[in-house]
Amino acid sequence: DTEIKVNPPQDFEIVDPGYLGYLYLQWQPPLSLDHFKECTVEYELKYRNIGSETWKTIITKNLHYKDGFDLNKGIEAKIHTLLPWQCTNGSEVQSSWAETTYWISPQGIPETKVQDMDCVYYNWQYLLCSWKPGIGVLLDTNYNLFYWYEGLDHALQCVDYIKADGQNIGCRFPYLEASDYKDFYICVNGSSENKPIRSSYFTFQLQNIVKPLPPVYLTFTRESSCEIKLKWSIPLGPIPARCFDYEIEIREDDTTLVTATVENETYTLKTTNETRQLCFVVRSKVNIYCSDDGIWSEWSDKQCWEGEDLSKKTLLR
């Protein structure tokens, strides 16, 4: 009885299509695979950024796999062929591993790359990124930002830079069609007559960096002798009501009475008849139903009642 063996895949490689971190892992079938034509051969693929503790593992019948990586670090991957037990009348047969690596040859020292990169997706409408120049770089250094997300044919360069002292220190992005809930890749590279500049790579999802506008139309309504309902409206823009969390700060007679987080556009407050002044502000944030993270909006304008009996009046501003 001859032992069944299978070769590893051929020409296993990591291909960079120029999407700033979204890479293709691809391979060719092992030689003599047609001996197992009646049988579906599978491949076990393992990959990770160099320095990561854990491998991602995929089992596939395809000859390629695509995923996002951090190009600030190298990438390593390995693959082997799997013959399921149905093909071998016994136990699963595995080939030896084929291995490959990929990294972008770094130019310049790490200090030359941009510092304090910060991106905010204002009101789920306008993306703005800002950065500080690298440490010790000269004024002739200029930085360029490129971005890509699935749906674009190729990486695009920023066309509206924010400048300071003639240097690009930020980018105002155009309208980004169908760009949320998918990885958004950015590279900021640079050029200088003086010395090479290190590139920086960033990946995030736009819905996780949204900073909404503050709520509007704050009102008071007396519900009963000891309850006041605070109400407000969602900010203008594309974010639906179901996506908001709110934080309220209420002051009664110059004392912070309540700070609360709520999911609706109302909050009921217990009060006493002695209350002479009541003020509140609200801010909004995208909630866990619509994103994994977010940025609190600025506080709304303050809405106050003072000097009148709250029981006799609905106050609007």
Epitope: Q10, D11, V15, Q26, L31, H35, L63
Partner: antibody, heavy 118, light 107 residues
Framework: QVKLVESGAEVVKPGASVKLSCKAS????????MSWVRQAPGQRLEWVAT????????YYPESVKGRFTITRDNSTSTLYLEMRSLRSDDTAVYYC???????????WGQGTLVTVSS | DIVMTQSPLSLPTTLGQPVSVSCKAS??????VAWYQQRPGQSPRALIY???YRYSGVPDRFSGSGSGTDFTLTISRVEAEDVAVFFC?????????FGGGTKLEIK
């Protein structure tokens, strides 16, 4: 449909260099290895070079190793063969071919004649 | 290098007849053999891979067989458009090598 279109015919002197190109269309170029194969007048086909889909792997026979370089530009779906130190026995029709999943060649270009003559 | 030896060099036949072309490898190449057809003045066209599997669009009168060192291309009924040179190729190991070709002619 799959199409491979090579650059035009070349006449060069011995010792000179030339760079052939092959423009591909009708398939995802970066997913396929590509090869160059040549055929001297009245002779058998002779494999010249192969490059993997991403360009990480290149293969040559001893007869051209060090003189010929196969490259590819996946952004323009173009395959290249740079030939240096050409000799009269390099005279042939050069075909670009797509490598199928088993290293056979499933689609071929129309061929380009390279004549090396003093 | 693996040498691929084809026979016969020339194959005169009549329309509608079956013909076979032989290809012998100088060492074991498993089933890693392809067959190509080159009509006069044209580029090669792929017919068979992995010794016996037809590429799509290839008429079923073409078939391949063999493994190890002995391989055969068979045309069950020759048609006028089959006039060409047929080449075998091994891809079991680099360098990839081709047979010398068999010229199919109509008598």
């Amino acid at each position: 449909q799959v199409k491979l279109v090579e650059s035009g015919a070349e006449v060069v002197k011995p010792g000179a260099s030339v760079k052939l190109s092959c423009k591909a269309s009708g398939f995802t170029f970066s997913s396929y290895g590509m090869s160059w194969v040549r055929q001297a007048p009245g002779q058998r086909l002779e494999w010249v070079a192969t490059i993997s889909g991403g360009g990480s792997y290149t293969y040559y026979p001893e007869s051209v190793k060090g003189r010929f370089t196969i490259t590819r530009d996946n952004s323009t779906s173009t395959l290249y063969l740079e030939m240096r130190s050409l000799r009269s026995d390099d005279t042939a029709v050069y075909y670009c071919a797509r490598r199928d999943l088993r290293s056979a060649m499933d689609y071929w270009g129309q061929g380009t004649l390279v004549t090396v003559s003093s | 290098d693996i040498v691929m030896t084809q026979s016969p060099l020339s194959l005169p036949t009549t329309l509608g007849q079956p013909v076979s072309v032989s290809c012998k490898a100088s060492q074991n190449v498993d089933i890693n053999v392809a067959w190509y057809q080159q009509r006069p003045g044209q580029s090669p066209r792929a017919l068979i891979y992995s010794a016996s599997y037809r590429y799509s669009g290839v008429p079923d009168r073409f078939s391949g067989s063999g493994s190890g060192t002995d391989f055969t291309l068979t045309i069950s009924r020759v048609e006028a458009e089959d006039v060409a040179v047929f080449f075998c190729q091994q891809y079991n190991a680099y360098p990839l090598t081709f047979g010398g070709g068999t010229k199919l002619e109509i008598k």
